[in-house]
């Protein structure tokens, strides 16, 4: 077991791709969520609030992503065996304090049935 193992189903497979679910507390207002493959940053999403409670969503490393009030989903497509690895949701919480950086992760197993283009 890895330190910070996700206590929920982190990987959801569909159509030869995978949705990687990164949960965060619903009380969190401003944060940055990074998806790490091993130690490499694959994707990130930052949510901040400006004056008048205007919400800003930014990505420096863009992936197809989906934001809800307690999770960020990152989507990876065209799965192959090279995608098998440890993936981590690296969450930086800016608001409310205390500021903290937390890790949640799991191993993505790739099975033949989940590949996008199986050879018949």
């Amino acid at each position: 077991e890895i330190n910070g193992s996700a206590n929920y189903e982190m990987f959801i497979f569909h159509n030869g791709g995978v949705q990687i679910l990164c949960k965060y507390p619903d009380i969190v207002q401003q944060f940055k969520m990074q998806l790490l493959k091993g130690g490499q940053i694959l994707c990130d999403l930052t949510k901040t609030k400006g004056s008048g409670n205007t919400v800003s969503i930014k990505s420096l490393k863009f992936c197809h992503s989906q934001l809800s009030n307690n999770s960020v989903s990152f989507f990876l497509y065209n799965l192959d065996h090279s995608h098998a690895n440890y993936y981590f949701c690296n969450l930086s919480i800016f608001d409310p304090p205390p500021f903290k950086v937390t890790l949640t992760g799991g191993y993505l197993h790739i099975y033949e049935s989940q590949l996008c283009c199986q050879l018949k």
Epitope: Y8, P25, F99, T104
Partner: antibody, heavy 121, light 112 residues
Framework: QLQLQESGPGLLKPSGTLSLTCAVS?????????WSWVRQPPGKGLEWIGE???????NYSPSLKSRVTISVDKSKNQFSLKLSSVTAADTAVYYC??????????????WGQGTLVTVSS | DIVMTQSPLSLPVTPGEPASISCRSS???????????LDWYLQKPGQSPQLLIY???NRASGVPDRFSGSGSGTDFTLKISRVEAEDVGVYYC?????????FGGGTKVEIK
């Protein structure tokens, strides 16, 4: 009323692994709270060890990070602490506590009653 | 890490008299939302710590109104308007602005 109760061995040998559990009663561990461990060596002050959210997200004190693992078991409504390679310096009363976010801050309320762990050969 | 420094180390008090404890942080605990991220705890002899004050000046539920917290930025004070015998113990300040969460070294309040 939320209550926390620590349990685990009170005596350990050097180089062993400390394992403690904190049982949560009167409320759900899946609430919007971070669950922390804090320790207090005999006659000394308080030191924050780390915390976990019910999803499994963890955050540790840098000084202990290489030796600490905190995990959560939602089915048993409890969370646990493991501290590896212990020495006499890890002798302390270990407390579990809830980060009380419903008052806008990480304030600890309530605390467990604490359990004394002694490391000695 | 934010370093928290408390003074005095020990405080002999007379019941009915006021008492004051100081806490200083190595960096400002004032967040852009206007709150100071500082708590005060009391650890009575043989007991677990209990929350007295959160966000610098807010009394926790059930805490008598003789306890008050004040200050902003890096300098904070816990005041007891009239000390009672049950107030003896060690008082700790703690910053909750960022992790690692850090505590002051404690102030031991005892009856003269």
């Amino acid at each position: 009323q939320l209550q926390l109760q620590e349990s685990g061995p009170g005596l350990l040998k050097p180089s062993g692994t400390l394992s403690l559990t904190c049982a949560v009663s009167g409320g759900s561990i899946s609430s919007s709270s971070w669950w922390s461990w804090v320790r207090q060596p005999p006659g000394k002050g308080l030191e924050w060890i780390g915390e976990i959210y019910h999803t499994g997200s963890t955050n540790y004190s840098p000084s202990l990070k290489s030796r600490v693992t905190i995990s959560v078991d939602k089915s048993k409504n409890q969370f646990s602490l493991k501290l590896s390679s212990v020495t006499a310096a890890d002798t302390a009363v270990y407390y579990c506590a809830r980060g009380h976010y419903d008052i806008l801050t990480g304030s600890f309320d309530p605390w467990g009653q604490g359990t004394l762990v002694t490391v000695s050969s | 890490d934010i370093v928290m420094t408390q003074s005095p180390l020990s405080l002999p008090v007379t019941p009915g008299e006021p008492a004051s404890i100081s806490c200083r942080s190595s960096q400002s605990l004032l967040h852009s939302n206007g709150y100071n991220y500082l708590d005060w705890y009391l650890q009575k002899p043989g007991q677990s710590p209990q929350l007295l004050i959160y966000l610098g000046s807010n009394r926790a539920s059930g805490v008598p109104d003789r306890f008050s917290g004040s200050g902003s930025g890096t300098d904070f004070t816990l005041k007891i308007s009239r000390v009672e015998a049950e107030d003896v113990g060690v008082y700790y300040c703690m910053q909750t602005l960022q992790t690692p969460l850090t505590f002051g070294g404690g102030t031991k309040v005892e009856i003269k």
